[in-house]
């Protein structure tokens, strides 16, 4: 599907002291959606600063955000999910900066969970499985997953596999024998909805077995 918001790119920030970015999470708590915004500059003095969203809402014109430490947060069922909303930073009722945002283009999925790896001796492979809460959702159901794995000693040498299912097979011959591996997974919207990568799942660690040559078999 074509579109303009490139997955993983934050909304363009306004060129001023109050530039901010936001992400939405749909059906994050039952049928409730959430919207989270934060200033790009962590040093912004947020005292007296408020966030407000107007437009593309059901039954109301505007909603105010709650402030939680340095982030601003709304949980509601009132997002229309069609059309652009105007999100403004305000002080004393006066808007300092605003952005028009379609909430369906800034979706951040929930992190996958229950990641596990099972070695199949007969097949000489590893079956990677994980779960996602989005299988139960009605809106953001279709995701692309990014499975990343590395040998524990190779700090930055991550291998990545993109897949749309929640099951992946890694062939033993493509992994180093007798090595400890770390594996993790994250998700991004992949049908109609657009936005950002989820947080990574907790890492899972597994060890590959030694090479077991049959009698008379040559070392590769």
């Amino acid at each position: 599907e074509s579109g303009y918001a490139q997955n993983g790119d934050l909304e363009d920030a306004e060129l001023d002291d109050y530039s901010f970015s936001c992400y939405s999470q749909l059906e994050v708590n039952g049928s409730q959606h959430s919207l989270t915004c934060a200033f790009e500059d962590p040093d912004v003095n947020t005292t007296n600063l408020e966030f407000e969203i107007c437009g593309a809402l059901v039954e109301v014109k505007c909603l105010s955000f709650r402030k939680l430490q340095e982030i601003y947060f709304i949980e509601t069922k009132k997002f229309l999910l069609i059309g652009k909303s105007n999100i403004c930073v305000k002080v004393g009722g006066k808007s300092l900066t605003c952005k028009k945002i379609d909430l369906t283009t800034i979706v951040k999925p929930e992190a996958p969970f229950d990641l596990s790896v099972i070695y199949r001796e007969g097949a000489n492979d590893f079956v990677v499985t994980f779960n996602t809460s989005h299988l139960q959702k009605k809106y953001v159901k279709v995701l692309m997953h990014d499975v990343a794995y590395r040998q524990e000693k190779d700090e930055n040498k991550w291998m990545h596999v993109n897949l749309s299912s929640t099951k992946l097979t890694l062939l033993q011959r493509n992994l180093q024998p007798e090595a400890m591996y770390e594996i993790k997974v994250r998700s991004i919207p992949d049908h109609y909805f657009k936005g950002f990568w989820s947080e990574w799942s907790p890492s899972y660690y597994f060890r590959t077995p030694e090479i077991n040559n049959s009698p008379g078999e040559m070392d590769p």
Partner: antibody, heavy 118, light 111 residues
Framework: QVQLVQSGAEVKKPGASVKVSCKAS????????LHWVRQAPGQGLEWMGG????????AYNQKFKGRVTMTRDTSTSTVYMELSSLRSEDTAVYYC???????????WGQGTTVTVSS | DIVLTQSPDSLAVSLGERATINCRTS??????????MHWYQQKPGQPPKLLIY???NLESGVPDRFSGSGSETDFTLTISSLQAEDVAVYYC?????????FGGGTKVEIK
Amino acid sequence: QVQLVQSGAEVKKPGASVKVSCKASGYRFTDYELHWVRQAPGQGLEWMGGIDPKTGGTAYNQKFKGRVTMTRDTSTSTVYMELSSLRSEDTAVYYCARSGGRWYFDVWGQGTTVTVSS
Amino acid sequence: DIVLTQSPDSLAVSLGERATINCRTSESVSIHLLHLMHWYQQKPGQPPKLLIYGASNLESGVPDRFSGSGSETDFTLTISSLQAEDVAVYYCQQSIKDPYTFGGGTKVEIK
């Protein structure tokens, strides 16, 4: 008020190119994507593609890929649609339209008639 | 491409009477309660005008005699009490999948 003003009518020969402009006013140019929709004489509407004025990112109808190019000039709040290798069936009224949301069109230009004739 | 089939092709209705236009899509254009179907009115020599977005949301400034309904593959535009100024061609449009396609149009006339 919000307005999209398009360039004037064009007459072109087959094989030539045409470039139509659409100047936006009355709102912040980078807030809304702009699309192009054409209508052949006595026919229905056909979406050609769109551009995000903020990033310059484009989305084209596969039918026109390779023949259509959409660009923008943020300094003048103008978008352009260039269609190349014109043929007689490209004779149509070409509209630019603002996308109020994904992807419906809440403000339309007045239309630009392009006639392709030898 | 998603094909939108409007019916009828043309419709003659008395002033003050109800006009109903249907639009059927070749595949679903809904994601749960998000219905990516929109309706436009076009008068001769003019560009189209947005009436309804998201199947049932009335665009600002559009008279409330216009209403929309439907989900999945079947949608309806209703003019509750036809006025002389409503004589026009009406188009449906889907935006769930590129290319974003329009119906063939329904011509509404006064009987």
